[in-house]
């Protein structure tokens, strides 16, 4: 299967909402509750989300959203909202008609002729919106997430069932089965998939093996699998790697701790603009990349690669993706050249003069054998001791 | 207290047509959202279309889409429902019903009930 074509949207932003949301087979998501398998029900109306009108909440239609969301199906009905609405009372004859605002405001139910998600759909404005909201919670809680590899959107591959996070195997795991994780996760497509000690290995039980996604389910539990079985261990482990996860590097310097701001984002390689790269950007990106803290942010060189990223931070991130930041934004990035750096770690720092030991100083670790001591953080001169 | 009396009732061959009317008393017809219910000899009352306040959402039981069509005259303070290519299974008594705070698709969001009206489809 070819990979699926990025989307449309070049201008994108950590402040917009995720390309592809979590009930996409049904417009609808729990909000509010315990977990992703319990909660307010949410439709989706065009752009916007809306709460689902609790009066036409019927047994079908939680049956048919658990299974939608792959969270089993719904837990007894009396769990559910009561039948009885919890509405005014009808005008009295000779009232003014309220129908014009009732409309506006109205509440979207989603109404449903079977337990099935294919049977059932969102009619707008069905209830007033003041009315009580649609409720459920489902027998079986399952999520997916990925771990320990620098956020949300790249790691080990780990599935919730039955109460209980556990791994995939990696045997047979592919292209097409990472599809189906990033795009339920909202973390855009795939741009690896990788096979067991990439990340470090999960503990607990394996829920999948012989994972075989044809990479249009909605969900992973919708793929053909087979139960964990004994013979997969956690060095085998499946990770994925999506196209929303940002890595970083820097290149052209001494070493890997000073040179170009380059970020790995939607596949890849991408500049940094240098119109809002102050210290502490500069601050967060060195600490993330294990290397000390920022002494220099050097004039730099037209953008040449091919997209740009912009980052706003307060310098308190752990990683430059906690920061606000956009992606291709012209009017921010039109002025710009590419970002630079030289972090505390870097070799080149070592070549420098060493004059007397200042009275204030800072203490940062290089390597394990080597201890610097920084007088300015703009300033290259530095004790060796 | 809304008072629904329903009307067009017949009896039709099968593939025919039919339009059942339904005319509310309340001058504040609009703002009711209105329905039709029917049931068969021997058989449990079931939901068959219902609309919102202004005609601007119509939902429909599967069993009857693409063949019926319910809309409302809110100057007329008359609900309809036209009935295309009817089927022996259509034959049940229509119920014109009237909810004030949803769409009458579950029993127990309706406030007002009519008498009905008998559509036999027979050849």
């Known amino acids: 299967h070819p990979s699926p074509a990025p989307p449309d949207q070049l201008n994108t932003s950590s402040a917009e909402s995720e390309l592809w949301e979590p009930g996409e087979r049904l417009p609808v998501r729990l909000t509010n509750g315990s977990s992703s398998c319990s909660g307010t029900v949410e439709v989706r109306l065009e752009a916007s989300w809306e709460p689902a009108c609790g009066a036409l909440w019927d047994s079908r239609a939680a049956e048919a959203v658990c299974r939608a969301l792959g969270c089993g199906g719904a837990e007894a009905a009396s769990q559910l909202a009561p039948p009885t609405p919890e509405l005014p009372p009808p005008p009295a004859a000779g009232n003014t008609s309220v129908a014009a605002n009732a409309t506006l405001a109205g509440a979207p139910a989603l109404l449903c002729s079977g337990a099935e998600w294919r049977l059932c759909e969102v009619v707008e404005h069905a209830c007033r919106s003041d009315g009580r909201r649609a409720r459920v919670t489902c027998a079986e809680n399952r999520a997916l997430r990925l771990v320990d590899g620098g956020g949300a959107c790249a790691g080990r591959v780990e599935m919730l069932e039955h109460g209980e996070w556990g791994s995939v195997c990696d045997d047979t795991w592919d292209l097409e089965d990472a599809h189906v994780v990033c795009r339920q996760l909202g973390c855009g497509w795939a741009v690896q998939a990788l096979p067991g000690l990439h990340f470090t290995p999960g503990r607990g039980p394996i829920h999948r093996d012989q994972v075989n996604c044809s990479g249009a389910e909605a969900y992973l539990w919708d793929c053909p699998g087979l139960p964990g079985q004994h013979y997969c261990g956690h060095k085998e482990d499946a990770g994925a790697v999506c196209s929303e996860h940002q890595s970083w590097r820097l290149t052209g310097g001494a070493d890997r701790c000073e040179g170009q701001v380059e970020v790995h984002f939607r596949g890849v390689w991408n500049t940094v603009c240098d119109s809002e790269w102050y210290p502490s950007e500069a601050k967060v990106l060195c600490q993330s990349l294990g290397c000390g803290t920022a002494v220099e942010r050097p004039k730099g060189l037209p953008h040449s690669l091919s997209g740009r990223m912009y980052y706003s931070c307060n310098g308190e991130e752990l990683t430059l993706s906690n920061c606000s930041w956009r992606f291709n934004n012209s009017n921010l990035c039109s002025q710009s050249l590419a970002a630079r750096v030289l972090c505390s770690a870097s070799r080149s720092l070592h070549n420098l003069s060493t004059p007397e030991v200042p009275a204030s100083v800072q203490t940062v670790t290089i390597e394990s054998s080597v201890t610097v001591k920084i007088e300015n953080k703009e300033s290259r001169e530095l004790m060796l001791l | 207290q809304v008072q629904l009396v329903e009307s067009g009732g017949g009896l039709v061959q099968p593939g025919g047509s039919l339009r059942l009317s339904c005319s509310a008393s309340e001058r504040t017809f609009s703002d009711y959202a209105m329905g039709w219910f029917r049931q068969a000899p021997g058989k449990e009352r079931e939901f068959v279309a219902a609309i919102n306040w202004v005609g601007g959402s119509t939902y429909y039981a599967d069993s009857v889409k693409g063949r019926f069509t319910i809309s409302r005259d809110n100057s007329k303070n008359t609900l309809y429902l036209q009935m295309n290519s009817l089927r022996a299974e259509d034959t049940a008594v229509y119920y014109c019903?009237?909810?004030?705070?949803?769409?009458?698709?579950?029993?127990?969001?309706?406030?007002?009930w009519g008498q009905g009206t008998l559509v036999t489809v027979s050849s």
């Open positions: 019903v009237a909810s004030w705070g949803a769409m009458p698709v579950l029993t127990h969001v309706i406030n007002y």
